[in-house]
Amino acid sequence: YGSGSKLKVPELSLKGTQHVMQAGQTLFLKCRGEAAHSWSLPTTVSQEDKRLSITPPSACGRDNRQFCSTLTLDTAQANHTGLYTCRYLPTSTSKKKKAESSIYIFVSDAGSPFIEMHTDIPKLVHMTEGRQLIIPCRVTSPNVTVTLKKFPFDTLTPDGQRITWDSRRGFIIANATYKEIGLLNCEATVNGHLYQTNYLTHRQTNTILDVQIRPPSPVRLLHGQTLVLNCTATTELNTRVQMSWNYPGKATKRASIRQRIDRSHSHNNVFHSVLKINNVESRDKGLYTCRVKSGSSFQSFNTSVHVYEKGFISVKHRKQPVQETTAGRRSYRLSMKVKAFPSPEIVWLKDGSPATLKSARYLVHGYSLIIKDVTTEDAGDYTILLGIKQSRLFKNLTATLIVNVKPQIYEKSVSSLPSPPLYPLGSRQVLTCTVYGIPRPTITWLWHPCHHNHSKERYDFCTENEESFILDPSSNLGNRIESISQRMTVIEGTNKTVSTLVVADSQTPGIYSCRAFNKIGTVERNIKFYVTDVPNGFHVSLEKMPAEGEDLKLSCVVNKFLYRDITWILLRTVNNRTMHHSISKQKMATTQDYSITLNLVIKNVSLEDSGTYACRARNIYTGEDILRKTEVLVRDSEAPHLLQNLSDYEVSISGSTTLDCQARGVPAPQITWFKNNHKIQQEPGIILGPGNSTLFIERVTEEDEGVYRCRATNQKGAVESAAYLTVQGTSDKSNLE
């Protein structure tokens, strides 16, 4: 030891950074410095160890201005290996606070190459991927060769970069990966003997996923009750946490705290810290914070605790005392604003009886009654009964619920006919709408005129978006109205309004609408008012059954509001199948006020024209083709024959007489009369009867005497008969001129 210049750092008696000694020897280490100093020793050397002695710093050196201290360790052992440091004591004036000198002492022992031996149980070493990992198999001699192995059979070889060996620290893995997770061991062979120390690396992550406190904030308690708060920290697998609490009574350790880990979850760890305070007092109220730390990660969660001296209930309407809802709603919540502690028992009454017993649709949720699938039956008075038995506190409050119903027109729900009905021209008609709703709906009748063009076929003439007019009994719109009336009636136990519109004289087509509305909504029923001058809206007529050579005349009349695409077809059956044959040369259909007419004329028919003729029209509403059939049988032609020949006849002058010429034939014969071979025309005093079959002569004169002949003719031939008419009371003349 020289006593030269001032020592910035203490000076040790052993020079260099390290020193090797044998186990069993004594370690002498002196420290000299400019100020008082202290020693720091390896963790494996206990200050209480009898073998250790340290002299307190005392004056030494020239002029006794320096301080010296000696450390003596008798019979040094392998586990005394480590860093020995002498450092200046920090003083308020000293600038040498961090001034120190260290030396690493190896206490070499062939029987203990490793300072720490972990053979029975591996030492757990936490690792974080990407960070430095140290396998701390420190040795007692810098000359020991150590191999790092990973179970079951891998050797991790130092490469001077990622994996390095330091006899003072162990194996240093610069940036650890999952490959280093598992059972690792350090092996050293000394004097032919194998030594092993084992380490179990364990992945450490610091990911805190979630922190929660149960029960949720705010927590309310009565004086004397027990407060239990469970703080739950959810982390990634392999994350370890430190959990702590801040709370009003922390300074006096009011709470007991228990911790546990739940590893039953497959993808994370759940840590629980349970804080418990028995017999809470007013001083325990306030903010409770659960603090969760994992490495550099930190999360906290707060909850507020209220402590009440005694229980209380206050209840108010959350909305108005009278509430309204609508039938058909998925749910309605009747809610009261309640402040109470402890939680009261809750019973809801409907019209004085327990609501939940009345219907399974009533659900109690907190201070609310939830009504599922609201119906009119749910209208009534609802009372919430609140009671805290232990505090003998009871309160109740009633709210009235009105269930409104959107108007409904019952005739709309009854399945309507696929096509609208037809109203006979000139008829009196009663139109009815049966309406239900809450509040009671107002009913109005409207008229939508149909702006149709008579000159052409239109089947889209009447649309519901035409302008509409509100009707009253005196309205002169559309058809004359006899009356509009309303009456109340009970149907299926509910009050319904029946509104009736009486049409006095059905003349004008259009749409009548009954509209029912209340504050919930509006509903409308449209009644297509189609007037018809055709029975049933479809009529087929045959003028007469034709004979061979005559004309066939068929007529088809359809209601123009209901039918379109009118045509005549001939039905023929071939091999039990009915074929539809279109008929060419049909006339154009003619459109009238209410109907469409299509006439079919087939001239000069033959027997082959016999058959089933059908008029086909398409229903505008159903799209269905409707047929009306008529059988036509063309009669075979037959030459005329007289049923009775004429016979001579006498008649008095100024009298009258009838000559009858009844003929048959197909077609019906034409009858012509001759007198004295001159064709007789109808003139005053001579009348030809129906079909010329009778000849009537009034006020007979002598000029009327003569030969009368009738002739019956058709395509097949002719037949005639003659007779002489004698007029009595005339001068004698020759019968024949």
């Epitope: 990973k150 179970f151 079951p152 490959k179 598992g182 992945r203 697998l237 993808h267």
Partner: antibody, heavy 116, light 111 residues
Framework: EVQLLESGGGLVQPGGSLRLSCEAS????????MNWVRQAPGKGLEWVSI????????AYSDSVKGRFTISRDNSKNSLYLQMNSLRAEDTAIYYC?????????WGQGTTVTVSS | QSVLTQPPSASGTPGQRVTISCSGG????????VSWYQQLPGTAPKLLIY???QRPSGVPDRFSGSKSGTSASLAISGLQSEDEADYYC???????????FGGGTKLTVLG
């Protein structure tokens, strides 16, 4: 909770092949070595094969060496055992096992029957 | 034939203490950790003891393990009927790089 679910077992003729799979959940699969262990009907446990966590090293029992191949796909949390040239004596329940402290966690096993 | 030797059977009455031995060699039990497994009828084996004597969480402290030289043993005190099962010891053998199991011991709880 650690779960190991084996699949791929079945009936196969001698000389045939099978591929067993093991799907892992509830732990960080790539951190752990994995074993296949089998148990013949009415017999004791027999270790079959091990694979290190990174898949770089494997070992096999003498009875299956050269016929069986162990592999893993850490991205799919899956362990496999490819079994070729199967023999009647390979009939057993095959267990997938996680290795850390010991053989910590076992699957429920999949049955392999080798019979003509 | 198993590398590790276990008695094929053992028995005891409820409340009794039963010990199952496991004998090996220097390359397995002698130089590596021993683990013990319990297999209840019809179920997969379960880790009972690791690192010679450590118990996983959830395993009752009635089960204990020990190791000396090339032998290990499992002791079950306060025997219960639910302990009736097959018990296997295992260790890594670093001479041949394989896991070795004992042949298993069937434990019967009498009465």
């Amino acid at each position: 909770e650690v779960q190991l679910l084996e699949s791929g077992g079945g009936l196969v003729q001698p000389g045939g092949s099978l591929r067993l799979s093991c799907e892992a959940s509830g732990f960080i699969f790539r951190d752990y070595n994995m074993n296949w262990v089998r148990q013949a009907p009415g017999k004791g446990l027999e270790w079959v094969s091990i694979i290190t966590n990174d898949g770089s090293s494997t070992a096999y029992s003498d009875s299956v060496k050269g016929r069986f191949t162990i592999s893993r796909d850490n991205s799919k949390n899956s362990l496999y055992l490819q079994m070729n040239s199967l023999r009647a004596e390979d009939t057993a329940i095959y267990y997938c096992v996680k290795v850390y402290y010991g053989m910590d966690d076992w699957g429920q096993g999949t049955t392999v029957t080798v019979s003509s | 034939q198993s590398v590790l030797t276990q008695p094929p059977s053992a028995s005891g009455t409820p409340g009794q203490r039963v010990t199952i031995s496991c004998s090996g060699g220097s390359s397995n039990i002698g130089s590596n950790y021993v683990s013990w497994y319990q297999q209840l009828p019809g179920t997969a084996p379960k880790l009972l003891i690791y690192f010679n004597f450590q118990r996983p969480s959830g395993v009752p402290d009635r089960f204990s393990g020990s190791k000396s030289g090339t032998s290990a043993s499992l002791a079950i005190s306060g025997l219960q009927s639910e302990d009736e099962a097959d018990y296997y010891c295992a260790a890594w053998d670093d001479r041949v790089n394989v896991w070795v199991f004992g042949g298993g011991t069937k434990l019967t709880v009498l009465g």
